[in-house]
């Protein structure tokens, strides 16, 4: 017997030829006996089924031997054996319906899990294999579970059910809420300005939630929260922001935030947190701020850098133009009795340069100016 | 597993130029500095220089400084060392290495290129 | 410029026994921000390319057998291969990274006796 494999809310062809290629009197059947369609001439009759409906044949093709038994809309329990009588034989077809769905909704959080479901007939024993968008594969029976969903696994996950060597492929689209950047480093000069942005990696219709910056300064023993604002259909509300430093929140996405002034006592690490309506848990982005100081105290040339650097990190100090003086992987570096000139504080990464300040050093009789 | 492949031996004249090739392989180019380590028959290593293949950036030993141009090509994942005005106690074996842990310690070697300078 | 002296140049040890390997460093190359020390070792056979060993002084390279072991902080620093085997015939190097320009010793000729 024939085996078709089908999918939940699609439509099915079951076919049916007779040798003679003209039309000639068909019934289509369930195991149950109970007839679904046939033909009266050239008319087409339906019997008692549940599928009434949703049954259907091609006319156009009864001409030339072929009654097709159209099934709209499948349920897992269309799965059925349906027989086809035609010039005294009987054709059987044994129709197996599937359904594959996501747990939950199919808008979910980075770090949670998502699970599929599997829906089949009784009596089958399917296996199903699924490619995530970056070409993860996973296989199970029943249900497939990915913990820990990261921003690449947003896209089509191609899903394959197998049955009796037949196969029949489901697509399911996911997104995965997330920021475009799990972390992010910004380097500034002592009094610039600073800018952080905190894209998101999907867009959706409407948006909204509430979100909040907790800072954790290098220099403090405990972290404070610098800004909370409600996020109301992509429009941005600042709710309540500390007094030292004065940040200031863009109205529109992506969220934007400004503080004024590069400071030593800024320098650290922050995590945004972002609770969207209707979702459980919360999304995270973290923001590390490294600040840059270069000065000269009487003889002594210093160059500092606070904030979250890595230990690969080389700072040096330079004259314009020439090989740096010192070059180490500290957070301090200084020059005793500095000639005259421009000097370069350079925070690099294997000759990258990543944050840089100058600084001029007059002859000794006069004051050092800082551009 | 990243490699690096240098490119192969090379005879040169005192006061010329040799531009030693590195290949990676098997891994992301840009996200870690290339250095260049040379060995003299019988000598010690003596590191000549890195390249950040990211940013371009570069930087010489003293020594060496005016004489060796290190550079990269990110679209061949190919980094170059060129050492000019070649001089006898050039001749050395060139080493291309890579530090792909996050420190400066070379885990990862090119076998090496074996330069000559005779007249 | 910090300059990296090994003692010794060569050394003869048998089979089975305790291998050790000095380096001292002409300045610190322990740094104050992150506590670490920027000093390497490493093995190099005859017309091979070095081979890591030992990073951060005394973390062993992911595949480098256990008898090989790194010690040090500062200026001073030692390799030790607790028991040796032939295959350990090599010269063996250290290397600074705290500051550039990065530094190697000059070698250390390890032999079987």
């Known amino acids: 017997k024939k085996v078709v494999l089908g999918k939940k809310g699609d439509t099915v062809e079951l076919t049916c030829t007779a040798s003679q290629k003209k039309s000639i009197q068909f019934h289509w059947k369930n195991s149950n006996q109970i007839k679904i369609l046939g033909n009266q001439g050239s008319f087409l009759t339906k019997g008692p089924s549940k599928l009434n409906d949703r049954a259907d044949s091609r006319r156009s093709l009864w001409d030339q031997g072929n009654f097709p038994l159209i099934i709209k809309n499948l349920k897992i329990e269309d799965s059925d054996t349906y027989i086809c009588e035609v010039e005294d034989q009987k054709e059987e077809v044994q129709l197996l319906v599937f359904g594959l769905t996501a747990n939950s909704d199919t808008h979910l959080l980075q770090g949670q899990s998502l699970t599929l479901t599997l829906e089949s007939p009784p009596g089958s024993s399917p296996s199903v294999q699924c490619r995530s968008p970056r070409g993860k594969n996973i296989q199970g029976g029943k249900t497939l579970s990915v913990s820990q969903l990261e921003l690449q696994d947003s896209g089509t996950w191609t899903c394959t059910v197998l049955q009796n060597q037949k196969k029949v492929e489901f697509k399911i689209d996911i997104v995965v809420l997330a920021f475009q950047k799990a972390s992010s480093i910004v380097y500034k000069k002592e009094g610039e300005q600073v800018e952080f942005s905190f894209p998101l990696a999907f867009t959706v219709e409407k948006l909204t939630g509430s979100g909040e910056l907790w800072w954790q300064a290098e220099r403090a023993s405990s972290s404070k929260s610098w800004i909370t604002f409600d996020l109301k259909n992509k429009e941005v509300s600042v709710k309540r922001v500390t007094q030292d430093p004065k940040l200031q929140m863009g109205k529109k996405l992506p969220l934007h935030l400004t503080l004024p002034q590069a400071l030593p006592q800024y320098a650290g690490s922050g995590n945004l947190t972002l609770a969207l309506e209707a979702k459980t848990g919360k999304l995270h982005q973290e923001v590390n701020l490294v600040v840059m100081r270069a000065t000269q105290l009487q003889k002594n040339l210093t160059c500092e850098v606070w904030g979250p650097t890595s230990p690969k990190l080389m700072l040096s100090l330079k004259l314009e133009n020439k090989e740096a003086k010192v070059s180490k992987r500290e957070k301090a570096v200084w020059v005793l009795n500095p000639e005259a000139g421009m000097w370069q504080c350079l925070l690099s990464d294997s000759g990258q340069v990543l944050l840089e300040s100058n600084i001029k050093v007059l002859p000794t009789w006069s004051t050092p100016v800082q551009p | 597993q990243v490699q690096l492949v240098q490119s192969g031996a090379e005879v040169k004249k005192p006061g010329s130029s040799v531009k030693v090739s590195c290949k990676a392989s098997?891994?992301?180019?840009?996200?870690?500095?290339i250095s260049w380590v040379r060995q003299a028959p019988g000598q010690g290593l003596e590191w000549m220089g890195w390249?950040?293949?990211?940013?371009?950036?570069?930087n010489y030993a003293q020594k060496f400084q005016g004489r060796v141009t290190i550079t990269a090509d990110e679209s061949t994942s190919t980094a170059y060392m060129e050492l000019s005005s070649l001089r006898s106690e050039d001749t050395a074996v060139y080493y291309c290495a890579r530090a792909s842990r996050g420190d400066d310690a070379f885990d990862i070697w090119g076998q090496g290129t074996t330069v000559t300078v005779s007249s | 410029d910090i300059v990296m002296t090994q003692s010794p140049d060569s050394l003869a040890v048998s089979l089975g026994e305790r291998a050790t390997i000095n380096c001292k460093s002409s300045q610190s190359v322990l740094s104050s921000s992150y506590n670490k020390n920027y000093l390497a070792w490493y093995q190099q056979k005859p017309g091979q390319p070095p081979k890591l060993l030992i990073y951060?002084?005394?973390a062993r390279e992911s595949g480098v057998p256990d008898r090989f072991s790194g010690s040090g902080s500062g200026t001073d620093f030692t390799l030790t291969i607790s028991s040796l085997q032939a295959e350990d015939v090599a010269v063996y190097y250290c290397?600074?990274?705290?500051?550039?320009?990065?530094?190697f010793g000059q070698g250390t000729r390890l032999e079987i006796k």
């Open positions: 390249i950040n293949p990211n940013s371009g950036g570069t």
């Open positions: 951060w002084a005394s």
């Open positions: 290397q600074q990274y705290y500051s550039i320009p990065i530094a």
């Open positions: 098997g891994g992301t180019f840009s996200s870690y500095a």
